[in-house]
């Protein structure tokens, strides 16, 4: 049952004279809360009395009592999980064994904790890495086995004694586990920082100097080097003799092997810190370096770049860029090695000098199809003059020129002819390779550049081409001008305005859309019978006997169109009545008699009317009025009146004989 | 209230033997410690004999070593068994209880400052 009580806290802690200690510690008795604590300095356990002996720093008791060291002693702890402790000052003589004497309801407890005071402020602990190699980036750890709430402390970094401007990153840790300040620096070392002393200083609030600890930097780098050279400036000719020289500044650790290197590429058999150059060529121009290597790796020399003068070469021209676009631009860049650089240059277009133009670059802002042809030239240094060399070709593409749409066809063109067209230009880079027409039509190509329109219709106004190559030139529309016969033609009433009425002025216009040519001539024509020659076809008076089927029509030199034919119908009054009797207009007694009215109206008749011989209207209303039997006294005359949306008309007087048949003479 | 009461004192010769008893009543823990002490004139009150309820171990000062028997019972009473006693034995001897101590894990079988105490009982050890 020694597992009811757990506590956990620093095995040992670190103070010094006049600092104080932070004792973190945490504590579990299963069977209930505290009932009472006593902190003992260097308990001592007697056998004989069966009692600690030792200082009682702290006690707190069920009675409450506590002796007046508790105010440098402080127990910050409770009564079930906290055994914090604290003394604030401390001092050199509380070094040993704190004991903290713990009592609950059934158990009692002594718990040991160890203190260890300094006289004086312990050194804090410099960490660093296994090894420390030159740009990479460690990280230094000034580590100090104190924090204390009560007494704030500062680790700073010095480097040969000057702070370091690195931002360190400072953490304290003050719980169960573990109590310390710790001070973390980032720092990336260079080559000229071995041996260097680091030292990490502990200090108060008030930046006061406490204690520190130091360490000498083993910074492991690749050898440093210096290079030499005679002549110093290394500009030499061709023939002349060089000196280069090795020297190493600085290696840790020490350097292994030696070598020279020029434009990145070791040279061989040259492992000495001399390397000697006797009657350079311009081809041992270039940079130069030594190379030095130790267990790091291979340090460099800065490069020497040593330059063998010498006159041009033959030159090259380089064309930025070929084929060229009309219009755009061209630079041309005259290329030749030389040492020192030429100074001058001399260019030619097509074998003939280009005036003015002396420098590397030839730039044409605008390119013309003139500009095409071989350009070469000719570079000059103060060694001498180089050659001319092959030269490069300029080739300047443009669209195909002055293109024209060509009739082929005898003028003029009649609707329904067939149409050739052809496609012309006059110059083109590249070569065409095809043509476009506009507007789009089935339409036959027999042959690249010619166009076949069979059947041409009388609205093919105007044709265009393009000749094309990477580029499309199109031509000025050409105008086809075709000629037809009149278009649309149709007979339009132009008054009256509303319905003809027999009597009433009338004019027929004869329309028609279009003609080419534009001279015309009209015929008016009716049931074959020729009217007029004018484009209007007039009635002063018109009469019924007018109204038929009209047709007009329109001729030029293409040919003749007609109109549809056009019913003229005249409106007017009921007309030309009579009355016609049936069976005849004298009848027997007791017969049947029909009479008629007949008569001639546009519209038709809509209502009859029908009077006697004493002008009295009559019950009937029809066309026909039926008598049967027919009597006597029906004889006498009869007149009708026919009523349309024009007007009224009346017929003469009929007469109607009836008279007496046999048996009523018979029975006289 | 815990309260003990010692019996079995009184005045033995050299050699002779006597049988302390320690009563126990209002004690409620199951787990505790009891013990013996004697404080002759003049000197100080040491551990005599202690008996731990939960494994029956025992302490004996070196003085009684061999002489002296401990032991209790289920009622918590305990017992003092004395032979061979000498002048020298001659003190009041007190019954203690209290509960087990610990130090660090370790378990003492004569607890610091027993809480609990007899009035004490005279044992004189006289030819």
């Known amino acids: 049952d020694s597992s009811k009580w757990v506590f956990e806290h620093p095995e040992t802690l670190y103070a010094w004279e006049g600092a104080c200690v932070w004792i973190p510690c945490t504590y579990r008795a299963l069977d209930g809360d505290l009932e009472s604590f006593i902190l003992f300095h260097n308990p001592e356990y007697n056998k004989n009395t069966s009692k600690f002996d030792g200082t009682r720093l702290y006690e707190s008791t069920k009675d409450g009592k506590v002796p007046s060291e508790q105010k440098r002693v402080q127990f910050l702890g409770d009564k079930n999980k906290n055994c914090t402790l604290s003394i604030h000052p401390v001092h050199l003589n509380d070094s040993g064994q704190l004991g903290l004497r713990m009592e609950s309801k059934t158990e009692k407890w002594m718990e040991r904790i160890h203190l260890n005071v300094s006289e004086r402020p312990f050194p804090p602990h410099i960490q660093l890495p296994p090894e420390i190699q030159e740009s990479q980036e460690v990280t230094l750890t000034c580590l100090l086995n104190f924090s204390c709430y009560g007494y704030p402390i500062q680790l700073q970094w010095l480097l040969e004694g000057v702070p370091m401007r690195q931002a360190a990153v400072t953490s304290t840790s003050l719980t169960i586990k573990s109590v310390f300040t710790r001070s973390e620096l980032k720092f990336s070392p260079q080559w000229s920082h071995h041996g260097k002393i680091v030292t990490c200083q502990l200090q108060d609030a008030d930046g006061k100097f406490l204690s520190n600890d130091t360490v000498q930097l083993n910074v492991k780098h690749t050898p440093k080097l210096e290079i030499k050279v005679t002549p110093s400036d290394a500009i030499v000719r061709e023939g002349d003799s060089v000196t280069m020289t090795c020297e190493v500044s600085s290696s840790n650790p020490e350097y292994t092997t030696v070598s020279w290197l020029k434009d990145g590429t070791s040279l061989k058999k040259q492992n000495t810190f001399t390397l000697n150059l006797r009657e350079v060529t311009k081809d041992q121009s270039g940079k130069y370096c030594c190379q030095v290597s130790n267990d790091v790796g291979p340090g460099r020399s800065e490069e020497v770049f040593l330059q063998v003068q010498y006159a041009p070469e033959p030159s090259t021209v380089q064309i930025l860029h070929s084929p060229a676009v009309e219009g755009s631009q061209v630079e041309f860049l005259c290329m030749s090695l030389a040492n020192p650089l030429p100074t001058n240059y001399t260019w030619y277009h097509n074998g003939k000098e280009m005036q003015g133009r002396t420098e590397e670059k030839v730039h044409i802002p605008k390119i013309l199809p003139w500009h095409a042809g071989t350009y070469s030239c000719v570079a000059e240094n103060i060694l001498g003059t180089g050659q001319r060399g092959p030269g490069a070709e300029l080739d300047v593409q443009y669209p195909p020129k002055k293109v024209t749409t060509v009739i082929q066809n005898p003028m003029p063109i009649r609707e329904g002819d067939t149409v050739t067209l052809s496609c012309n230009y006059n110059s083109s880079n590249p070569s065409v390779t095809r043509y476009e027409w506009k507007p789009h039509g089935a339409w036959e190509e027999p042959s690249l550049g010619v166009l076949k329109i069979q059947n041409v219709g009388w609205d093919n106004t105007t044709i265009a081409c393009a000749a094309c190559n990477s580029w499309c030139s199109w031509a000025s529309p050409v105008a086809l001008n075709v000629q037809y016969a009149p278009r649309d033609v149709r007979v339009r009433k132009i008054k009256p305005l509303s319905e003809i009425h027999s009597g009433n002025s009338v004019s027929l216009q004869c329309d028609f859309s279009s003609s080419h040519p534009k001279e015309v001539q009209f015929f008016w024509e009716k049931n074959g019978r020729l009217l007029g020659k004018e484009s209007q076809l007039n009635f002063d008076s018109i009469s019924p006997e007018d109204a038929g089927s009209y047709s007009c029509w329109v001729n030029n030199s293409i040919g003749q169109t007609a109109s549809k034919a056009w019913t003229l119908e005249v409106l007017y009054a009921p007309r030309r009545l009579r009355v016609s009797m049936s069976p005849g207009d004298q009848v027997m007694e007791g017969k049947s008699a029909t009479l008629t009215c007949e008569s001639d109206a546009n519209p038709p008749v809509s209502h009859y009317t029908w009077f006697d011989w004493n002008n009295q209207s009559l019950p009937y209303h029809s066309q026909k009025l039926r008598l049967e039997p027919v009597k006597v006294q029906h004889s006498g005359a009869y007149w009708c009146q026919g009523t349309n949306s024009v007007g009224k008309g009346r017929s003469p007087l009929s007469t109607l004989t009836v008279y007496y048949s046999p048996e009523t003479i018979g029975r006289r | 209230q815990v309260k003990l009461e010692e019996s079995g004192g009184g005045l033995v010769q050299p050699g002779g033997s006597l049988r302390l008893s320690c009563t126990v009543s209002g004690f409620t823990l199951d787990s505790y410690v009891m013990g013996w002490f004697r404080q002759a004139p003049g000197k100080e009150r040491e551990a005599v004999s202690c008996i731990s309820s939960s494994d029956g171990v025992t302490y004996y000062a070196d003085s009684v070593k061999g002489r002296f028997t401990i032991s209790r019972d289920n009622a918590k009473n305990t017992y003092l068994q004395m032979n061979s006693l000498k002048p020298e034995d001659t003190a009041i001897y007190y019954c203690?209880?209290?509960?087990?101590?610990?130090?660090?894990?370790?378990?003492?079988?004569?607890?610091?400052?027993?809480?609990?105490w007899g009035q004490g009982i005279q044992v004189t050890v006289s030819s």
């Open positions: 203690a209880v209290d509960k087990p101590f610990y130090d660090g894990g370790y378990l003492y079988t004569c607890p610091v400052d027993f809480d609990s």
